[in-house]
């Protein structure tokens, strides 16, 4: 968002007054409170960055993220017999992505129509709440998954019901925490009419009084508590994991696991570099500039960073791929347009010819393979 202010003050996640209503008079609209944006912000709001680039990225995220996370959630819930902690965290990660991505058609339409929100105040608040909620949920569940991966390597004990229950408890706590920290986004008025541009923005222009102090403090707190601290935990887990893998004996199976672990680490690192770090950094810088100077010179960068943060919904499936054997199987077969059941039946058929006694350990109706840990 940029700063605007309203004319009894002017308004961008710019600055303005919160009680703006309007009534039509002839050709134009008479506004009760004017939200006036600076020229740079207006050029961003009407330019190709927000009306072409953003909808393209969001369309890609929607087209990739919806089916892949949908399939992942389905696999983790219905096609994975043993609900290991990692499966639980990944299921929550997929759910968080889905809850954000399902609103993207509205977001795409908003940007294509020149950043003009026509779907009402409530939907705008839901969209924004879920947008930020997804980012912070992803960070926290990714942290849990990373710590859990390290824990499994250090402490390779079998699956226990207790561990699964702890993972469920942690997941519920994360959802509750995110719900609480995003309450301000649902409560604050997010839609603002900009008379100069004849558009109603959603979150892109926010009231001055709110932004100057509160938004900076809010996003700074989130950046420290829900980004930096989890990022430190994630990095620590992976550094320790790499050390453990380096020092361990290398048979063929261990080598495969090591390669997969490295791919996972690279994927999570990419996610932090592309999605989480730029957005959290620029959220703080952007609101700091508004607070101190009344306008943000990094507005365009901030917009791009927030846009890129949604790519986590496309990157998460790669995490599932490197962690879950089940998801790997379903993903491969989905791409090859064949069912896992068919593949399993082929495997069973081949196995029974060679080892008739061993074939009893595979049920042709089974669609699960042990998740790799």
């Amino acid at each position: 968002t940029i700063q605007g202010t309203n004319r009894s003050s002017k308004g961008r996640s710019l600055i303005g007054k919160v009680d703006g209503t309007s009534h039509v008079t002839g050709k134009g609209v008479t506004v009760e409170t004017v939200f006036s944006v600076d020229e740079f912000s207006a050029s961003v709001l009407t330019g190709k960055l927000t009306t072409v680039f953003l909808p393209i990225v969001y369309t890609i995220v929607f087209v990739v993220g919806l089916p892949s996370n949908g399939m992942a959630l389905w696999v983790f819930l219905f096609r994975t017999k043993k609900k290991h902690p990692a499966v639980i965290y990944m299921a929550n990660l997929a759910l968080a992505d889905l809850l954000s991505v399902i609103w993207f058609p509205l977001k795409i339409a908003y940007h294509i129509h020149g950043n003009n929100w026509i779907y009402g105040e409530a939907l705008c608040n839901v969209l924004i709440g879920f947008f930020y909620g997804n980012m912070y949920c992803s960070i926290l569940f990714m942290t849990c998954l990373s710590v859990q991966r390290y824990w499994v390597i250090v402490n390779p004990m079998g699956h226990s019901r207790k561990k699964a229950n702890i993972a469920i408890g942690i997941s519920l706590a994360i959802w509750l925490l995110i719900l609480l920290v995003t309450i301000p986004l649902y409560v604050v008025k997010q839609t603002i009419f900009i008379p100069a541009l004849n558009i109603t923005t959603c979150h892109d222009v926010l009231p001055e009084q709110l932004l100057v102090g509160d938004m900076f403090n809010y996003f700074l707190s989130l950046a420290i508590g829900v980004f930096l601290f989890p990022a430190f935990l994630t990095a620590s887990a992976y550094v320790l994991m790499i050390r453990m893998l380096r020092s361990s004996a290398m048979d063929e199976n261990s080598e495969k696991k090591r390669k997969r672990a490295i791919k996972l680490i690279v994927t999570v690192l990419a996610m932090y570099l592309i999605c989480f770090t730029p957005s959290n950094l620029l959220l703080v810088v952007h609101y700091f500039l508004i607070k101190s100077q009344g306008q943000s010179h990094v507005y365009a960068l901030y917009i791009v960073a927030l846009c890129l943060s949604t790519l986590n919904s496309c990157i998460d499936p790669f995490v599932y791929y490197f962690v879950s054997h089940d998801f790997r199987d379903h993903a491969k077969n989905a791409l090859l347009c064949r069912s896992v059941r068919t593949v399993k039946q082929m495997q069973v058929s081949l196995t029974s010819k060679k080892h008739s006694r061993k074939s009893s350990s595979y049920s042709s109706s089974s669609t699960t393979v042990k998740t790799s840990y």
């Epitope: 309203n6 008079t25 006036s36 100069a196 004849n198 100077q293 009344g294």
Partner: antibody, heavy 119, light 106 residues
């Protein structure tokens, strides 16, 4: 060359409606609007209302119930109407060009029209 | 509503002298302050916008400074045509004019 030219009735009786026109030259109404400002004799400046080129308006809350500002894009003209005038509305009325953005000033002004309200 | 207080109300100086006009806002208006010059019987004329940007065609002897709540218009060396009334205008939150400072010949 940017120019704003004003005209309208100079002498009004109380309760009548003040009507002024501001014709603009040298710039596009797509990009600019105007603000109306008044200055009572020997006093400071007070803004009355603003209109964007797209027709959207915003009025000073203290005058809102009596003010109407409109635009005729075909003639490149803006008009100000102030109803139920009293002696307190006696002032020089100015129109000034405004880009419509927060960081833009009122860079060019009309010559001003003295309106006197007297019974 | 933001209130702008200009001081002094009147400034008596001779041509060639330096004039310093002050404008104080009741709250933070960042850089969104303009200065206008008005001569008797004329419309105000924009001199400085956004605290320190000189409007087209305005002589370099005019300069603006400040930020937040305290702003200054400086005329480095007064010319005979500079004797007039000067108004500040804030446009951060609504529009408010200051009461004006009259610069007169001593």
């Amino acid at each position: 060359q940017v120019q704003l030219q004003q005209w309208g009735a100079g002498l009004l009786k109380p309760s009548e409606t003040l009507s002024l026109t501001c014709a603009v030259y040298g710039f596009s109404l797509n990009s600019y609007g105007v603000i109306w400002i008044r200055q009572p004799p020997g006093k400071g400046l007070e803004w009355i209302g603003v209109i964007w080129g797209n027709g959207n308006t915003y009025y000073n809350p203290s005058l809102k119930s009596r003010v109407t500002i409109s635009v005729d894009t075909s003639k490149n003209q803006f008009s100000l109407k102030l109803s139920s005038v009293t002696a307190a509305d006696t002032a020089v009325y100015y129109c000034a060009r405004w880009r419509g953005y927060k960081d833009y000033p009122f860079d060019y002004w009309g010559q001003g029209t003295l309106v006197t309200v007297s019974s | 509503e933001i209130v702008l207080t200009q001081s002094p109300a009147t400034l008596s100086l001779s041509p060639g002298e330096r004039a310093t006009l002050s404008c104080k806002a009741s709250q933070n208006i960042y850089k969104y302050l303009d200065w206008y010059q008005q001569k008797p019987g004329q419309a105000p004329r924009l001199l400085i916008y956004n605290t320190n940007s000189l409007h087209t065609g305005i002589p370099a002897r005019f300069s603006g400074s400040g930020s937040g709540r305290d702003f200054t218009l400086t005329i480095s060396s007064l010319e005979p045509e500079d004797f007039a009334v000067y108004y500040c205008l804030q446009h951060n939150s609504g529009w408010t004019f200051g009461g004006g400072t009259k610069v007169e010949i001593k």
